[in-house]
Interface confidence: low
């Protein structure tokens, strides 16, 4: 679509005569008729296929034509066309005399024609005017002409439609050749694709307007380059969405099981050495002088009754000291200077001479012991406490302090780990020697049946066009990450195809 423009500049008819030679009375009131048609080697009568236009009376005999409107007519004259400009044309310009005000062809006398010119040739679309002058015996016409494209039409033939826009269908202005020039922040064939925030991850981020970076499911951060770990992940990270890769010292599906209790909690007291022995489990090796699960109890070295023969024990900073009764000596009062004559056996013990009276031995009644029957029997010496229980003398009786997981007088009973009903979602609990095991019903897994086994929503390959499928474990649904050029929840629609056919 375009316009053939004809600019009439000057008409000379010095004698004021018609084509027949007859003079106009009182002068030739001149108007023009223009016919534009397809190229003809010899311009012949027939329809003005490209259009016609007439002017009002522009002057008498000889006159110059102004560039703007003149008596209601426009100069340049406009001959619009709504087809591809063919590049060639034929042009006929007729000058007529108007005796009255009615300029219709049927209202004019047959001999009212002043002059007629016909030209043909090639003409390219462009802003530059072609100047021409046609002279006959009696008249001369000077004019110029050109072809320009209508608004929104471009190209060598005005065949390229381009209308600037800034909406859902495109964000562009038009170049002189009709090609699109995207507005800042937009790209793509039709400038519909926003240019995302610089650095926005190509696959994991997208945008609906320029300088934006929206994250696809499973990703976060300003540039959508940080994965979102599995919901509930405590001490872990991810390299792809919904992962939970445990930090050092942590285990379990959610990295919430402490495998390094020693480092994280420092449970051992008084300089004891801590050793990890499983999830939330540890063992403290106590320094001399301390006891208890966490070595929190100070141990008196006299508690083991190291002094024999009735010697009394005194605690000291660096150990203990035995105060021996008369007739005994040595670190533990173990050496005797007595004989049976000195009645050394206490608590009804009977004395027996040894080594020709140089030594003796006491035979003690039940419940007494020691080289002089001076000690009540230590009920803990036989180590009656099972499963690592600690034996404590309490007057006439003894008592076992049991390790966690054991009970009973002698710590002989294993506390049922299953008593707390630790298995979730109806799991069956089994007591083991050093812990428990859960047998999970269908659809659940994990140490305590706490994890709902996810259905792999991606197994059915729901995404089209080589899109990447992600399973959202929290909802058992899938998310399709579309490659460039496709849209839709399953990436089923192509985007930005070139038009299927020209309009």
């Amino acid at each position: 679509s375009g316009v053939f423009q004809l600019q009439l500049q000057e008409f000379i008819n010095e004698r004021g005569v018609l084509a027949s030679g007859r003079p106009c009375e009182p002068g030739c009131r001149t108007f023009f008729r223009v016919c534009l048609k397809h190229f003809q080697a010899v311009v012949s009568p027939g329809p003005c296929t490209f259009g016609t236009v007439s002017t009002p009376v522009l002057g008498t005999n000889s006159f110059a034509v102004r560039d703007d409107s003149s008596g209601g007519g426009r100069n340049p004259l406009q001959l619009p066309f709504n087809f591809t400009w063919p590049g060639t044309f034929s042009l006929i310009i007729e000058a007529w005399h108007a005796p009255g005000d009615d300029l219709r062809p049927e209202a004019l006398p047959p001999d009212a024609l002043i002059s007629k010119i016909a030209i043909q040739g090639s003409l390219a679309v462009g802003q530059n005017w072609l100047l021409d002058e046609q002279t006959s015996t009696l008249t001369r016409l000077r004019y110029s002409y050109r072809v320009i494209c209508s608004d929104n039409y471009y190209g060598d033939n005005c065949s390229r439609l381009c209308k600037k826009r800034n909406d859902h269908f495109g964000h562009y202005v038009c170049q002189p050749d009709g090609n699109l020039s995207c507005l800042p922040g937009w790209t793509g064939e039709y400038c519909q694709q926003p240019i995302c925030l610089s650095g926005c991850h190509e696959q994991n981020g997208y945008c609906s307007k320029p300088a934006e970076c929206l994250c696809r499911p499973g990703w976060q951060g300003r540039l959508c380059n940080e994965c979102i770990p599995h919901n509930g992940c405590r001490h872990g990270t991810c390299s792809t969405p919904w992962q939970c890769t445990c930090d050092e010292g942590w285990g379990g599906l959610f990295c919430d099981q402490d495998l390094n209790y020693c480092t994280h909690h420092s449970p051992c007291k008084n300089g004891a050495t801590c050793s990890n022995s499983g999830q939330r489990s540890y063992t403290c090796t106590c320094r001399p002088g301390y006891t208890g699960v966490d070595c929190e109890l100070e141990l008196s070295e006299c508690d083991s009754n190291p002094c024999r023969n009735g010697g009394s024990c005194k605690d000291q900073e660096d150990g203990y000291h035995c105060l021996c009764p008369p007739g005994y000596y040595g670190l533990h009062c173990e050496h005797s200077t007595l004989s049976c004559a000195d009645s050394p056996c206490f608590n009804g013990g009977s004395c027996r001479e040894r080594n020709q009276g140089a030594n003796y031995a006491c035979e003690c009644p039940p419940n007494f012991t020691g080289s002089n029957c001076e000690k009540k029997v230590d009920r803990c010496t036989s180590n009656p406490c099972a499963n690592g229980g600690q034996c404590l003398n309490r007057g006439p009786s003894r008592m076992c302090r049991c390790r966690p997981g054991f009970t009973g007088t002698y710590c002989e009973l294993h506390v049922s780990d299953c008593a707390r009903n630790p298995c979730a979602h109806g799991g069956t609990c089994h007591d083991l020697e050093n812990g428990l095991m859960c047998t999970c019903p269908a659809g659940f897994s994990g140490r305590r049946c706490e994890v709902r086994t996810s259905i792999d929503a991606c197994a059915s390959s729901p995404c089209f066009n080589r899109a990447t499928c992600y399973t959202d474990l929290s909802t058992d649904t899938f998310v399709c990450n579309c490659p460039y050029g496709f849209v839709g929840s399953r990436c089923e629609f192509p985007v930005g195809l070139p038009p299927s056919f020209p309009w």
């Epitope: 859902h168 629609f493 195809l497």
Partner: nanobody, 120 residues
């Protein structure tokens, strides 16, 4: 699968009216621009009208402006073309078309078409 099914065509006298319907399925209807184009025997396919997805803006070819009206019903997933003051030169097969947004006059999917004949 994208499906576009046209109906409402037929024989009508010059100056008469017809209303074409296009039932759409297989995609999220309200998210996309839809329109109509036609093809007369021995002629090139000609764009007729289009309606955008966002604000329902309508576009018409000069040859039908003032006579044809396009509309859409996002609940019924249907697009309509009301044709008034029909002329013999409107005779053609009319196709309903779905645009995936490349341009409002470039269509990616279209239906089988419905015949409109304007004759006395």
């Amino acid at each position: 699968e994208v499906q576009l099914v046209e109906s409402g065509g037929g024989l009508v006298q010059p100056g008469g009216s017809l209303r074409l319907s296009c039932a759409a399925s297989g995609f999220t209807f309200e998210n996309y621009a839809l329109g109509w184009f036609r093809q007369a025997p021995g002629k090139e396919r000609e764009w007729v009208s289009c309606i955008s997805s966002s604000d329902g803006t309508t576009y018409y070819a000069d040859s039908v402006k003032g006579r044809f009206t396009i509309s859409r019903d996002n609940v019924k997933n249907t697009v309509y073309l009301q044709m008034n003051r029909l002329k013999p030169e409107d005779t053609a097969i009319y196709y309903c078309a779905l645009s995936l947004g490349s341009s409002w006059c470039a269509y990616d999917y279209w239906g089988q078409g419905t015949q409109v004949t304007v004759s006395s």
